[in-house]
Interface confidence: low
Amino acid sequence: PPEAVTIDEITDTTAQLSWRPGPDNHSPITMYVIQARTPFSVGWQAVNTVPDLVDGKTFTATVVGLNPWVEYEFRTVAANVIGIGEPSRPSEKRRTEEALPEVTPANVSGGGGSKSELVITWETVPEELQNGRGFGYVVAFRPHGKMIWMLTVLASADASRYVFRNESVRPFSPFEVKVGVFNNKGEGPFSPTTLVYSAEEEPTKPPASIFARSLSATDIEVFWASPIGKNRGRIQGYEVKYWRHDDKEENAKKIRTVGNQTSTKITNLKGSALYHLSVKAYNSAGTGPSSATVNVTTRKPPPSQPPGNIIWNSSDSKIILNWDQVKALDNESEVKGYKVLYRWNRQSSTSVIETNKTSVELSLPFDEDYIIEIKPFSDGGDGSSSEQIRIPKISNSYARGS
C-alpha cells in the first residue's frame, strides 16, 4: 500500500494531500483513489479530487467538495492492471475551516397549538452541514400579505420549534413563515416561504338534525347536518359518540369522520339493544358542543339455527337443493329467505342466489367440483351458515347426495 497520507493544507471545502508510493509488486501503479472518513460517514468514502483522475506518477492531489467545520481523515488506495491494493494508513484527523451556513432547515411547517399561538416547526440541520460553531436559527414570520417580517433568533442548533404567543393572533389566520440559519461566521440563507396557520378555536356550534336508524342487529347508521348559523371554528370532521343503555356514558365509544361527511355507519353492536348517540364537530383545537342525544334500538339478531337436512340431486345439467325450513326463536329476527352461496372448487369468488323457498335449482356445468353452503337472512342480518357441501363433478346424467 502507499505510505501514510499527509494533509499539507486545509480550507473550508478543500484539502491538499501528498503521499509516497509503496511497492508496486512488479506491475506499475496506474492510478490512486483518495478516500475520506468523518464522524458522520459510514466507513470510508471515495472523494472528488483535482485532478479528477490521479495517475500512478502523481503523489499529490487536492480533495474538493468537503463540508466546512468537519473533522476528516484521508487515505489512498493504489490500483494497477492486476487490481486494487491495500489502502494506506489514514492521515491525521484535521478539521476543515468554518464557513457561512448554506443548508436551510427542511419541512418548515407548523400549526395547531393553543389560542393566540402561532406554532412553527422545522427539521434541524445535521451537524455536518452546520459549517461552524455557534449555529442557530432565525425564525421569520408575518401575517399573510403584510410587508414587515417579525424575527426571532434561537441560538441553539437543536431548536426545532418556536411558539409565538400574542393576543392579536386571530384563530386560524395565515402567516408566511421562513427559517434561516447562522453561525459564528454570519447569517446563511432562509428556507422558502411557507404558509402556516395560527391555532384555531374549536367549533362553536353543535351539529343539527341528528337521526339514527338500525340497519341490522349489529349495524346502525347515523345522519346529521352541519351546524346552523355562523360557526367560528373551522370544521375538520365530526365525532360520533355512542353507548349502550346498560353502559355508562363515560365508557362510550367514539368514531371520527373526516371532511364534509355527514353520516356514518357504526358496526359490531349488540342485537336488540338500545343505544344512545350524540355528534360533535371537531378540528385541531378540539371538539365543539355536543348535539342532542338520539336513541336507536338495534334489530333482533338473525336466526342462530343453520339450515339442516340439505339434500341435493342432479340431472340434465341442473343441481336441485332442498333443505329444512329454519324457524327463528322469539328473540331472533324472522327468516325472510335464504342465501345459497356456491363456487367452483378451484375458484375463489363466490356466487350468491337469494330465495324465499327452501329449495333452489342451479344450472351449473358438471365438469367442476362445487362447494355450496346455505344460510338464512333476516332484518337482523345473515344467520348461521350450513356446513359446506361438496358436490363432485358429475359425468353421468343423474346423481344425488346429502
Epitope: H144, G145, F172, P174, S226, P227, K230, N231, R234, I235
Partner: antibody, heavy 123, light 101 residues
C-alpha cells in the same frame, strides 16, 4: 356535476342598481364559500366579493366596498350580488364561483365557475 | 398586487413557464379560453385538480409562483391568471396570453 347559473345582468344607468342571482346545483351549497368575480371587456379577472358557507362572513374588494352586498339563501341554493351606485367602470361580465373547500382561509381556490352575466353601466 | 408577463409564446411541443410575483404565499392558476369561463389548473402552488393533464405543473419559491407547461399543445393557447391573497382580499394577476406557435 356542479352547475352555476347567473342571471340579472343588463343595461343600467350610472348611479343605478342591479341585483344578480346565481342558482347553484350539484353540491351541498351551504357547505361552501361562494364568490363573485368580474371581468371587464378585454381585461383580466377581478375578485369582487366572497361569502362564507353559512353566510355569516363576507369579504369585499376595495373598489366595491360599501356599494355592493353579497348574500345567499341556502334554502334556495342561491347566491346574490346587490349592486348600488353603479359606475361605468363596473361594466363587466360577472361570474358566480364556488370555493374548492368547505372552509376558505387565505388564498381562495375557485373550483367551479358559472358562464357569467354581462352588466353594462352606461347613460 | 400580483404581477404577470402580459404575453408569452412557445413552440408546439416545447416547455413554457409563466411566472407570477407578489406578496401571496399560496397561489392558484386559472386557464381562460376566449368566450369561456376560467378553469382551475393548479391550486395551492403545486396541486393539480383531477381532469387537468399532467403536462401542467406548478411551483413556488419565495414570493414568486410559476406555472410550467411541459410539451405545450395547440389547445393550451389561452389566457392564464394567477390568483392569491394579499392579506385582506383575494387578488388576480393581470393575466398572461400564451400563444402556441
Amino acid at each position: 356535476e356542479v352547475q352555476l347559473l347567473e342571471s340579472g345582468g343588463g343595461l343600467v344607468q350610472p348611479g343605478g342598481s342591479l341585483r344578480l342571482s346565481c342558482a347553484a346545483s350539484g353540491f351541498t351549497f351551504s357547505s361552501f364559500n361562494m364568490f363573485w368575480v368580474r371581468q371587464a371587456p378585454g381585461k383580466g379577472l377581478e375578485w369582487v366579493a366572497e361569502i362564507s358557507g353559512g353566510g355569516g362572513s363576507t369579504w369585499y374588494a376595495p373598489a366595491v366596498k360599501g356599494r355592493f352586498t353579497i348574500s345567499r339563501d341556502n334554502s334556495k341554493n342561491t347566491l346574490y350580488l346587490q349592486m348600488n351606485s353603479l359606475r361605468a367602470e363596473d361594466t363587466a361580465v360577472y361570474y358566480c364561483a364556488k370555493s374548492a373547500d368547505t372552509w376558505s382561509y387565505g388564498a381562495a381556490t375557485i373550483q367551479a365557475w358559472g358562464q357569467g352575466t354581462l352588466v353594462t353601466v352606461s347613460s | 398586487e400580483l404581477t404577470q408577463d402580459p404575453a408569452v409564446s412557445v413552440a408546439l411541443g416545447q416547455t413554457v413557464r409563466i411566472t407570477c410575483s407578489g406578496s401571496s404565499g399560496s397561489y392558484g392558476w386559472y386557464q381562460q379560453k376566449p368566450g369561456q369561463a376560467p378553469v382551475l389548473v393548479i391550486y395551492d402552488n403545486t396541486n393539480r385538480p383531477s381532469g387537468i393533464p399532467d403536462r401542467f405543473s406548478g411551483s413556488s419559491s419565495g414570493n414568486t409562483a410559476s406555472l410550467t407547461i411541459t410539451g405545450a399543445q395547440a389547445e393550451d393557447e389561452a389566457d392564464y391568471y394567477c390568483g392569491g391573497y394579499d392579506g385582506s382580499t383575494d387578488v388576480f394577476g393581470g393575466g398572461t396570453k400564451l400563444t402556441v406557435l
